[in-house]
Interface confidence: low
Amino acid sequence: TRDVREPPALKYGIVLDAGSSHTSMFIYKWPADKENDTGIVGQHSSCDVPGGGISSYADNPSGASQSLVGCLEQALQDVPKERHAGTPLYLGATAGMRLLNLTNPEASTSVLMAVTHTLTQYPFDFRGARILSGQEEGVFGWVTANYLLENFIKYGWVGRWFRPRKGTLGAMDLGGASTQITFETTSPAEDRASEVQLHLYGQHYRVYTHSFLCYGRDQVLQRLLASALQTHGFHPCWPRGFSTQVLLGDVYQSPCTMAQRPQNFNSSARVSLSGSSDPHLCRDLVSGLFSFSSCPFSRCSFNGVFQPPVAGNFVAFSAFFYTVDFLRTSMGLPVATLQQLEAAAVNVCNQTWAQLQARVPGQRARLADYCAGAMFVQQLLSRGYGFDERAFGGVIFQKKAADTAVGWALGYMLNLTNLIPADPPGLRKGTDFS
């Protein structure tokens, strides 16, 4: 006998990433005979579900399930019919549903039940809809990034597996309602809740991870809006010349703005709020999101959360990528250093509404929020996580790797379908009849 290749039959897996602002469906594929290889699973296709995230259907759970139908119909086309029954289908919900579960557990249960009901109607191997913990979201994002970049294990030209010397990459994810930081660390965590130990391909990894609920982009924008209403009566992060009617019920309905909620307020009242293009006041407003006053550990990131010093290279994805990409591509600003990132944020915050619209034609949605978004990303990385210039040099802002979206979804599927074994891979034996 000798080592042989079997016919390249493909297997498929589907993950619905139910985020706070929207849901994305990812279909993955891999050769059936190479399930335990690294870097073998790749993205086959994807689909963005129209409308808001499933947590936005708190008052209409059936609407949540119905919103998924278009993408599920696409999945029926994208996965060969003979593979439908053997294709695992997962739905994982993140911080939007974690927030809903805090404020209205009955509604979150109803949404998951409605979604489950619809997903079971399809011919795939449905394996559950659940809310991921912040820790899971962080770790699976880290697994995805390192799997795609082949940092766990590699197949050498001499025909054997080896562990690459470059080490693993840290992962930073900025979602709509939470943000996660995850990286390999040598020292044990002082806070056990922040440590995860993984055994992948015979290697042991000690990983630090933390998820900050209410520090996702959308919730940060809501919190800044609440602060602006409370302290200024104008919004220093919005461009001068931009004005909008703010419904107080919108601002204060999130648990993330609960602390800023006035004792008595009319939820149906509308307040006119204008921008002032003030980068310094905006920076102060963003600074107010972070607390550095008390730390029960030897060192903390912010809000009393333990974090070892950031080490090694990092990949920053989701809204980290979109924010930096806007600065780089739409605004034409350099962001290679922390200093440049800060200067770019100040530059955007200095623009009037007319200047911003002229500079970024055709992009109206969320345009007024890029100043706050950029200021937040810069402060989160430098002050929050403690990246200095040297460490920041090792951060890459990326949306995809190996034609696959970077996020928790792939890592989640790899874990649940046992596509990353704990043991080192061995060669399969077969008989060559040729």
Epitope: N60, V69, N104
Partner: antibody, heavy 125, light 106 residues
Framework: QVQLVQSGAEVVKPGASVKISCKAS????????MDWVKQAPGQRLEWIGD????????TYNQQFKGKATITVDTSASTAYMELSSLRSEDTAVYYC??????????????????WGQGTLVTVSS | EIVLTQSPATLSASPGERITLSCSAS?????IHWYQQKPGQAPRLLIY???NLASGIPARFSGSGSGTFYTLTISSVEPEDAAVYYC?????????FGGGTKLEIK
């Protein structure tokens, strides 16, 4: 203007089935879910279920599963509800109601903004 | 399922009087809608999402509340307000209605 016109009253025998209709006009039929609500004499309103005309997906209150079947004919902008194995306790006025909604910071909130005039179904031997 | 209890079951008021109808939920709900139903007619949306007046509804109607307790207030009752008023929740499957409060005008 937006209108929902339901079919006329029905008198049916126990064990039989009945199919009532709800014709919509004045709006794009596939843009809104259609719900059905039961009002038995002296009882509170009960939500039966709904249908999304765009995707032809219906959702039911557990209590009405097997009793009610909701369908649509999008070409006729009409929703239907069939009630089977009728018993005296199914005697009620049945309403179709359009599910209106408004967006509230990215969250859809729903309510019944337009109602049909109701169809009285009497189950009697 | 969430049970909505309305009180009082019947209320008699004179024109010009200010009245309050209440709706109590068996567990916390996000929002309540109110409907008005006159004899022989279909229900009509009065207030949506606790406090928003539906189109064409006079300003004498107002709603408030949160959690498990909600109210509908008519600041100055008119003869045409004689009807049954229902509260309705969309926070948890299945959507449910209250038993109704019948408003009679003296």
């Amino acid at each position: 203007q937006v209108q929902l016109v339901q079919s006329g009253a029905e008198v049916v025998k126990p064990g039989a089935s009945v199919k009532i209709s709800c014709k919509a006009s004045g709006y794009t039929f596939t843009d809104y879910n259609m719900d059905w609500v039961k009002q038995a004499p002296g009882q509170r309103l009960e939500w039966i279920g709904d249908i999304n005309p765009k995707y032809d997906i219906s959702t039911y209150n557990q209590q009405f599963k097997g009793k009610a079947t909701i369908t649509v004919d999008t070409s006729a902008s009409t929703a239907y509800m069939e009630l089977s194995s009728l018993r005296s306790e199914d005697t009620a006025v049945y309403y179709c109601a359009r599910r209106g909604f408004f967006l509230y910071y990215g969250i859809n909130y729903y309510y019944f903004d337009v109602w049909g005039q109701g169809t009285l179904v009497t189950v009697s031997s | 399922e969430i049970v909505l209890t309305q009180s009082p079951a019947t209320l008699s008021a004179s024109p010009g009087e200010r009245i309050t109808l209440s709706c109590s939920a068996s567990s916390s709900v996000s929002y309540i809608h109110w409907y008005q139903q006159k004899p022989g007619q279909a229900p009509r949306l009065l207030i949506y999402s606790t406090s928003n007046l539906a189109s064409g509804i006079p300003a004498r109607f107002s709603g408030s509340g949160s959690g498990t307790f909600y109210t509908l207030t008519i600041s100055s009752v008119e003869p045409e307000d004689a009807a049954v008023y229902y509260c309705h929740q969309w926070s948890s499957y299945p959507w449910t209605f209250g038993g109704g409060t019948k408003l009679e005008i003296k």
